[in-house]
C-alpha cells in the first residue's frame, strides 16, 4: 500500500509528446507503475512505464506518434492515470483531466549556429521543434549567454517578445570564448512553462586588429 | 449495440422554444461526447454545440450563443437540447450524435417546423 | 470559422466507376477530417475518422487520404448502394464545420 501525498504533473510538446513526473512521498517497494492516457473523443490510448528520477519521483513520456503528427489539439481534453500494480490489480493513485494547449512545454530550441561573428558581437540562429502549427507566431523566446567566470545562473535574460529565431549579441569583448542557450514558450496556456534550455552553443569572438582601439 | 433515440416531430410557432432528447444505450454514457448537429431542409450540416454527459461540460457554436442549451440526466442516459426564440430559418432536422473518433453513431433525427 | 470547400457539389456516375470527392480546409487541420454518407430522409452514416481510417463495417471500396488542407475520399469501384450525398467534416477546432455535400447521382 501507499501513504502520503503525491504530485501528478504533465507536459505536452503540443504534437506527440506528452511528459509526465508523478512524485509520491510514501515509500513505494518495487512497485510498478505506468502513465495511461486517455482522450475524451479519439480513438486510441497510450501508456508509459513510470522508471525513477529520484527517491520519490517518477517521469515517463507518452509518444503518441510520429513526433511531428498533431496528435492533440485545443478541443481535447485527456484523462491521466496514475496506475500501479497492487497484487494482482492496478490501483489508480492520481488522477487528472488534462487540457492539452492548457499545459504546454515544448522542445528545446535546436540547431543553433553562429551566422556571423565579430570582435564585439555576434549573430546566432535556431529552429524550433516539434512546434504545432496552432501556435503561428505566437511564440516567445528567452536567451542567455555565459561569460568566462560566470555561471548560467548568473547570466541575464534576453527576451524576445516574438516568434525570431535569431539574435544579435552585442557589446561582446573580442577574442572570448562563450557559449549562448535559448528556451522558447507560446503565449497560450495558463499552466504553460518555458521549454528546457538548448544544448549551448560555443562561439569565440574574434581577436581585436593589432593596433586597433579596442 | 451503441444507439441513439430521439424524440419525435415538433411543430413550434416563431419566439416559442423547443426541447428535443435523446436517449443514449449501449455505451457508457457518461465518457463520451454528444454532439448536436440541425440540417435545414436541401441544406448541409450545420454543428450546433456539444456536451460531455460526465461533467456537464458545454461547447456552443458561438452562432447559437444564448439560444441554445443542452443539459443531461445521467439517471436515464438522455441528453436534451432546447432552442429558445425560434424563428422559421430555425426549420430543419436535428441529429444528436456521438463524437468518437468523428461523430461516429447519429440519431433518427428530430423534424422541427417552425411556423405561423 | 474554418470552411470546407467540397468539390464538385454534383457528380453523375456508373456502376464499376471509380470516384474521388475533394474537400480544401480553409486552414490546417491536420488530420481531424470525417467524411459521411447520406441516403434521402435518414441520418448521417460515419464512413471515415482521422482522414483515413475506415469504421468498422464500411466496406474497403471506400477510402480516405490526405492532411492539412486537402483531402479526398475515394470509393474505388461505385455500387449501386453508394449513390448518396457525400459531407466531408472538420472537428480540428471549434466550432466543427461540415463540407456543402457533394451529391453522387448514377449516370
Known amino acids: 500500500a501507499v501513504n502520503g501525498t503525491s504530485q501528478f504533473t504533465c507536459f505536452y510538446n503540443s504534437r506527440a509528446n506528452i511528459s509526465c513526473v508523478w512524485s509520491q512521498d510514501g515509500a513505494l517497494q518495487d512497485t510498478s507503475c505506468q502513465v495511461h492516457a486517455w482522450p475524451d473523443r479519439r480513438r486510441w490510448n497510450q501508456t508509459c512505464e513510470l522508471l525513477p528520477v529520484s527517491q520519490a519521483s517518477w517521469a515517463c513520456n507518452l509518444i503518441l506518434g510520429a513526433p511531428d503528427s498533431q496528435k492533440l489539439t485545443t478541443v481535447d481534453i485527456v484523462t491521466l492515470r496514475v496506475l500501479c500494480r497492487e497484487g494482482v490489480r492496478w490501483r489508480v493513485m492520481a488522477i487528472q483531466d488534462f487540457k492539452p494547449f492548457e499545459n504546454l512545454r515544448l522542445m528545446a530550441p535546436i540547431s543553433l549556429q553562429v551566422v556571423h561573428v565579430e570582435t564585439h558581437r555576434c549573430n546566432i540562429s535556431w529552429e524550433i521543434s516539434q512546434a504545432s502549427h496552432y501556435f503561428e507566431r505566437h511564440l516567445e523566446f528567452e536567451a542567455r549567454t555565459l561569460s568566462p567566470g560566470h555561471t548560467w545562473e548568473e547570466a541575464p535574460l534576453l527576451t524576445l517578445k516574438q516568434k525570431q529565431e535569431w539574435i544579435c549579441l552585442e557589446t561582446l569583448t573580442p577574442d572570448t570564448q562563450y557559449e549562448f542557450q535559448v528556451r522558447v514558450k507560446p503565449l497560450q496556456g495558463e499552466f504553460t512553462t518555458w521549454s528546457p534550455w538548448s544544448q549551448p552553443l560555443a562561439f569565440r569572438t574574434k581577436p581585436a586588429a593589432l593596433g586597433k582601439d579596442t | 449495440q451503441v444507439q441513439l433515440v430521439q424524440s419525435g416531430a415538433e411543430v413550434k410557432k416563431p419566439g416559442a422554444s423547443v426541447k428535443v432528447s435523446c436517449k443514449a444505450s449501449?455505451?457508457?454514457?457518461?465518457?463520451?461526447?454528444i454532439e448536436w448537429v440541425r440540417q435545414a431542409p436541401g441544406q448541409g450540416l450545420e454543428w450546433m454545440g456539444e456536451?460531455?454527459?460526465?461533467?456537464?461540460?458545454?461547447n456552443h457554436n458561438e452562432k447559437f450563443q444564448g439560444r441554445v442549451t443542452m443539459t443531461r440526466d445521467t439517471s436515464t442516459s438522455t441528453v436534451y437540447m432546447e432552442l429558445s426564440s425560434l424563428r422559421s430559418e430555425d426549420t430543419a432536422v436535428y441529429y444528436c450524435?456521438?463524437?468518437?473518433?468523428?461523430?461516429?453513431?447519429w440519431g433518427q433525427g428530430t423534424t422541427v417546423t417552425v411556423s405561423s | 470559422d474554418i470552411q470546407m470547400t467540397q468539390s464538385p457539389s454534383s457528380l453523375s456516375a456508373s456502376v464499376g466507376d471509380r470516384v474521388t470527392i475533394t474537400c480544401k480546409a480553409s486552414?490546417?487541420?491536420?488530420?481531424?477530417v470525417a467524411w459521411y454518407q447520406q441516403k434521402p430522409g435518414k441520418a448521417p452514416k460515419s464512413l471515415i475518422y482521422?482522414?483515413?481510417y475506415r469504421y468498422s463495417g464500411v466496406p474497403s471500396r471506400f477510402s480516405g487520404s490526405g492532411s492539412g488542407t486537402d483531402f479526398t475520399l475515394t470509393i474505388s469501384s461505385l455500387q449501386p448502394e453508394d449513390f448518396a450525398t457525400y459531407f466531408c467534416?472538420?472537428?480540428?477546432?471549434?466550432?466543427?464545420?461540415f463540407g456543402q455535400g457533394t451529391k453522387l447521382e448514377i449516370k
Open positions: 482521422s482522414a483515413s
Open positions: 450524435t456521438r463524437h468518437y473518433g468523428s461523430f461516429d453513431y
Open positions: 486552414q490546417n487541420v491536420d488530420t481531424d
Open positions: 449501449g455505451y457508457t454514457f457518461s465518457r463520451y461526447w
Open positions: 467534416h472538420q472537428y480540428s477546432s471549434y466550432p466543427f464545420t
Open positions: 456536451i460531455l454527459p460526465g461533467s456537464g461540460s458545454i
